[in-house]
């Protein structure tokens, strides 16, 4: 291995192989007691009034004063060591018998206490002047986050002690904070990149990397900012962090350029009623710029001239639109585009759609409404409406006809079929006023009613009637 | 533009030894690591070590008790010392960017011989 | 100390893809490894092509690129010039130390 390794495996190892601390006997072995019973202590020794680690009267603060200082042992201070390399350190301390009370040694990190699932020893060497006690940690295949200053506490007759920092650096590959990040860009128009990675060791330098050949003959010191001064086509790019242990490579990340979006594609009639069309379509690639509004196109496939187009403007979202004020019957041709930041895409192809039949747009004309006494019904004729074509096939009427008198409202209708222009239905109500209206019924619906014609219904009597308010051209009002 | 610029004594007699001094432009030599790679004549590659950039070393486990690689930052010089040489050390000796090997520098010549 | 094997010489025509080869006696070589490509012309001229992560240095044409191929590192020249004919070295770094192959030799006709 290098020398830096080397250093790593020896160096470490003598902080167990060398000599202990303070003035024990070497035939002394000593007792051993893990972190999780960490206040563990030795067994007393006899001839002593007060063994070490043990409860003891409390010593008075003059007393106290008096006891020599006691403090941890120096120790390495600064250990460097790979990634996934095994660690082991120690703290040590000489408690002179003259102290009456102490507690187990706590290993703490960066200022908080390391407890649970941490690999520490502690050993204890007594002696005829008191007792080395040596608090042993061991860390298995170090990561980034073992970084960080280790220390040892502990309580001498109730003072708390501290020993130096230790401080592990574990070294490694960059590591990236911050990576490139995909970005879709107009063309020929600069836009930045961000690469960030850390070590230790430092420092961390960057290469640029663009479609597989390096940007920068020069590293740049992470954090690094690549300025791109545009581009023309799609590009991948990636960042390369290099430092003494290796180089690590970020994601690459596409480039792509805003470019106008693709035609959509499956335009749909959902929907057809006479006077409207409900189209869908599936956008097209939105040429890495979101879709900003789409425009719908119309027009009459029936026009054997070019006829105009009518445009229909809408959102890009959702991909539905109900085109309104058409003709009834009527055949049109549709297609749709749709825009980005960029431009407009082409059309997507036309397709063929039909309006339905609309319902009939006049009333019946010269309505007349006469009296049969002695059938006791009503007479009611009228002339067919002139329906045009997109009105749709004439299938029937709907006659209207309400009756009132003093304390009595009665609403009737009947649809009658298309043969003639005439019905009969029976009188409901004497000593009434009866109020006729009729409208045209075609497949595509019922259309607007005529004026109403009112007649008086008497007790048995003579009869008053009044014709349609919507006589044919050159009749009068009276019968 | 990086470049690299070695230079050496030529001719070394058998058991001396041997430094060369490689200039760094366009680039601080805390920003790269620098290796140390030869050929012997009518040979191919072989590499001797590299500085890191944070001063560390690493070596040709091979040649390692012969050779001490230094730099002076300030400077931007890296050095190359090879002690006891022998006539099968007689090539021409490169310094290079380390990560990638793509900056060279044109190479001095060392012949070992009395 | 590991030992990096590739073709003696390889010969090729204008415009052809060649490519070249560099295999570790360790075991399959891995992004770890870094394997770097070297041309070699004469006068000692040495020229980095292919680094680090298989990027092209700076100002080394896109016919040159680096990939791993099985349990190689591999360098092709797509559509070969007859300026490329070169001795070409691969390297390859084991933790701590970079092994050179021996070098290819590569004629184009």
């Known amino acids: 291995g290098g020398t830096a390794e080397k250093w790593e495996e020896t160096e470490l190892d003598q902080l167990f192989s060398g000599p202990l601390p303070g003035r024990l006997p070497v035939n002394h072995r000593p007792f051993s007691a893990p972190h999780s019973s960490r206040d563990q202590l030795p067994p007393p020794q006899t001839g002593r009034s007060h063994p070490a680690h043990t409860a003891a009267p409390q010593v008075t603060s003059t007393a106290s004063k008096l006891l020599p200082p006691v403090a941890f042992n120096h120790t390495i201070g600064h250990i460097v060591l790979s990634e996934h390399k095994n660690v082991k350190f120690n703290c040590s301390i000489n408690i002179p018998n003259t102290y009456q009370e102490t507690a187990g040694i706590s290993w703490w990190k960066d200022g908080k206490e390391l407890l649970g699932a941490h690999h520490s020893i502690t050993q204890f060497y007594p002696d005829e002047e008191g007792v080395s006690i040596i608090a042993l940690f061991s860390i298995a295949s170090v990561q980034r986050s073992d970084n960080g200053s280790y220390f040892c506490k502990m309580k001498v007759n109730n003072r708390e002690i501290v020993s130096d920092p230790i401080y592990v650096e574990v070294q490694g590959l960059p590591y990236f904070i911050k990576q490139p990040e995909s970005v879709n860009v107009t063309r020929n128009t600069a836009f930045n990149l961000t690469c960030q990675a850390v070590g230790p060791p430092e420092p961390v330098n960057i290469f640029w990397v663009q479609n597989s050949s390096r940007v920068n003959e020069k590293p740049e010191r992470s954090p690094s900012v690549l300025t791109v001064p545009g581009l023309t086509e799609t590009a991948v790019f990636s960042c390369e962090a290099h430092n003494d242990k290796g180089l690590t490579v970020s994601k690459g990340v596409h480039i792509n350029i805003k470019v106008i979006p693709s035609p959509p594609t499956e335009v749909h009639i959902l929907n057809s009623t006479a006077h409207s069309i409900l189209v869908s379509w599936v956008p097209g690639f939105d040429g890495y710029s979101p879709l900003q509004n789409c425009s719908i196109q119309v027009k009459e496939a029936d026009r054997l001239s070019n006829g105009s187009v009518m445009v229909f403007n809408t959102s890009a979202s959702p991909h539905l639109y109900e085109i309104q004020q058409l003709q009834a019957l009527a055949n049109y041709s549709i297609a749709v585009s749709c825009r980005n930041e960029i431009g407009w895409s082409a059309v997507s192809p036309w397709i063929l759609a039909s309006t339905t039949e609309g319902a009939p747009s006049v009333a019946p004309l010269n309505i007349t409404v006469f009296l049969n006494e002695s059938n006791n019904i009503l007479d009611i004729r009228w002339t067919k409406p002139p329906i045009k074509r997109q009105d749709g096939e004439l299938v029937g009427y709907r006659i209207s006809h309400v009756w009132e008198s003093a304390g009595t409202y009665k609403e009737l209708s009947e649809e009658v079929s298309q043969n003639g222009s005439w019905a009969q239905i029976p009188v409901q109500i004497h000593n009434a006023t009866c109020t006729v209206r009729i409208a045209a019924i075609t497949k595509g619906g019922i259309g607007p009613f005529s004026e109403p014609v009112n007649i008086i219904i008497p007790e048995h009597s003579k009869v008053d009637y009044a014709p349609s308010s919507t006589p044919a051209p050159g009749n009068t009002d009276s019968m | 533009q990086v470049q690299l610029k070695e230079s050496g004594p030529g001719l070394v007699a058998p058991s001396q030894s041997l430094s060369i001094t490689c200039t760094v432009s366009?680039?601080?030599?805390?920003?790269?690591?620098i290796s140390w790679v030869r050929q012997p004549p009518g040979k191919g590659l072989e590499w001797l070590g590299v500085i890191w950039t944070g001063g560390g070393t690493d070596y040709n486990s091979a040649l390692k008790s012969r050779l001490t690689i230094s730099k002076d930052t300030s400077k931007n010089q890296v050095f190359l010392k090879m002690n006891s040489l022998q006539t099968d050390d007689t090539a021409r000796y490169y310094c290079?960017?380390?990560?990638?090997?793509?900056?060279w520098g044109t190479g001095t010549t060392v012949t070992v011989s009395s | 100390q590991a030992v990096v094997t590739q073709e003696s010489a390889l010969t090729t025509s204008p415009g052809e893809t060649v490519t070249l080869t560099c295999r570790s006696s360790?075991?399959?070589?891995?992004?770890?490894?870094?394997a770097n490509w070297v041309q070699e012309k004469p006068d000692h001229l040495f020229t980095g092509l292919i680094g680090?992560?298989?990027s092209r240095a700076p100002g080394i044409p896109a016919r040159f690129s680096g990939s791993l191929i099985g349990d190689k590192a591999a360098l092709t020249i797509t559509g070969a010039q007859t300026e490329d004919e070169a001795i070409y070295f691969c390297?390859?770094?084991?933790?701590?130390?970079?092994?050179f192959g021996g070098g290819t030799k590569l004629t184009v006709l």
């Open positions: 360790t075991g399959a070589v891995s992004t770890s490894n870094y």
């Open positions: 390297a390859l770094w084991f933790s701590n130390h970079w092994v």
């Open positions: 290079a960017s380390h990560w990638y090997l793509d900056v």
């Open positions: 366009g680039i601080s030599l805390s920003s790269f690591a």
């Open positions: 680090g992560a298989n």
